[in-house]
């Protein structure tokens, strides 16, 4: 008789999840010499320990503490790029501008990017059928708590000028409920961070509006200013040209506004 299993609203754990995490860890530590000493089996043990045998709606940041510890990574604190609702362009940017880092360029972000996982209370099984959805089921699920925890630590580590890439095509360019708006903004350390510079990425080719005047950007400016951090904003009217100019800054067409 098959055992009764909780049916959640979200997709189940990504197939071959343990193998994927371990393989990603090995690949990352081979490519990044500063993390070469990290023992990927211990990293997997810590990852597994955060959610296996635990109720998938009752996960805490402390559950992930061992994993966070093993994944501790020093990135240049003045070279951090945050993003909200525009992951692909942010990643394309750091692939070209190799001295800047998104969360997914760190070991822990790389391990979990685009993956889903959850377990079941009191069993050592991974649930490949379904996992809790943030809205429909619960917010304290393994995936959401993981990203909240790593995002908090990533923001806490930032210094000097921090950049954030925002999607100008969305109705809320700055969304207080996004990970950036609810976690990262509030964990930038005013004693270390001087300025938050927003890059608002335009979607339409003919869109010449100044999206830095958008009410949600003004809201972001207000939140940041109240935290004694300066705020600046730039429109990126042509993201394709922007990337091209990052690749080839000497190009004559790169002196004009992008």
């Amino acid at each position: 008789v098959p055992r009764w299993r909780q049916q959640w609203s979200g997709p189940g754990t990504t197939k071959r999840f343990p193998e994927t995490v371990l393989a990603r860890c090995v690949k990352y530590t081979e490519i990044h010499p500063e993390m070469r000493h990290v023992d990927c089996q211990s990293v997997w043990d810590a990852f597994k320990g955060a959610f296996i045998s635990k109720h998938p709606c009752n996960i805490t940041e402390e559950d992930y503490q061992p994993l966070m510890k093993l994944g501790t990574q020093t990135v240049p604190c003045n070279k951090i790029l945050l993003w909200s609702r525009i992951k692909d362009l942010a990643h394309q940017f750091t692939q070209v501008q190799r001295d800047m880092f998104t969360l997914e360029d760190t070991l822990l972000g790389y391990l979990a990017d685009d993956l889903t996982w959850c377990g079941e209370f009191n069993t050592s099984k991974i649930n490949y059928q379904s996992c809790p959805d943030w809205r429909k089921d619960c917010s304290n699920n393994p995936v959401s708590v993981f990203w909240k925890t790593v995002s908090r630590r990533f923001a806490e580590a930032a210094c000097d000028v921090v950049h954030v890439m925002l999607n100008g095509s969305r109705s809320k360019i700055f969304d207080k409920n996004s990970t950036f708006g609810s976690v990262e903004v509030h964990n930038l350390q005013p004693e270390k961070v001087q300025t938050l510079e927003a890059w608002v990425i335009h979607g339409g080719r003919e869109d010449s509006r100044d999206l830095c005047q958008d009410p949600t950007i003004k809201e972001l400016e207000s939140i940041i200013s109240k935290r004694n951090i300066q705020f600046s904003c730039k429109n990126i009217y042509r993201p394709d040209k922007f990337l091209q100019c990052v690749k080839n800054p000497e190009d004559s067409s790169c002196t004009s506004e992008i």
Epitope: Q73, T149, A157
Partner: antibody
Framework: SLEESGGDLVKPGASLTLTCTAS????????ICWIRQAPGKGLEWVAC????????KYYANWAKGRFTVSKTSSTTVTLQMTSLTGADTATYFC???????????????WGPGTLVTVSS | AQVLTQTPSSVSAAVGGTVTINCQCS????????LAWYQHKPGQPPKLLMY???NLASGVPSRFKGSGSGSQFTLTIGEVQSDDAATYYC??????????FGGGTEVVVR
Amino acid sequence: SLEESGGDLVKPGASLTLTCTASGFSFNNYWICWIRQAPGKGLEWVACIYSPSGDIKYYANWAKGRFTVSKTSSTTVTLQMTSLTGADTATYFCARELSGSSYEGYFESWGPGTLVTVSS
Amino acid sequence: AQVLTQTPSSVSAAVGGTVTINCQCSQSVYGHNWLAWYQHKPGQPPKLLMYRASNLASGVPSRFKGSGSGSQFTLTIGEVQSDDAATYYCQGYYNGGSYAFGGGTEVVVR
């Protein structure tokens, strides 16, 4: 508090197991690490373990392979050392890390240490 | 491997004076400020003084001050007392949760 035991005078090539015993708290939700200090030298980190359910452990590069950290009960952690050489002569401390993710990376509580001497 | 260089290796101070100990890290510590200071007296376990570069550990007098960020840190002991005679160590926190200690600074109080 923490207390180390098992330090001894041993010959090169020998093995030795040190024990760290807690009183007044259990190891279950703390990182416990081993740190050593050679005579007249500075402190050197060896290994750490965290054991809420399954053991999570990691080591300094130089300690991998020869040293093994284990939790043997909720109040005892051991450090097994093999193929000992004169360079391993040191006072070995166990230490408890500050709890909470904002405080990791520091040792709030140390044992008095146990002396290991490797000599023929 | 990370190297933490403490200077001076030994310092003598009069009671009521000030002592400054520097810790230079070969690589920036995690989070730019993940550095601790310990006081170690002979026959006793080391005692945590400061964490996150400038935060005083519980029960430590405010005469102890920590500063610095990245790879350069300083411990200052103001109004030195005879009880402050000890060896002081800095300790950084690094990639993969690894730790590295400085070589120590002996403080002699005269």
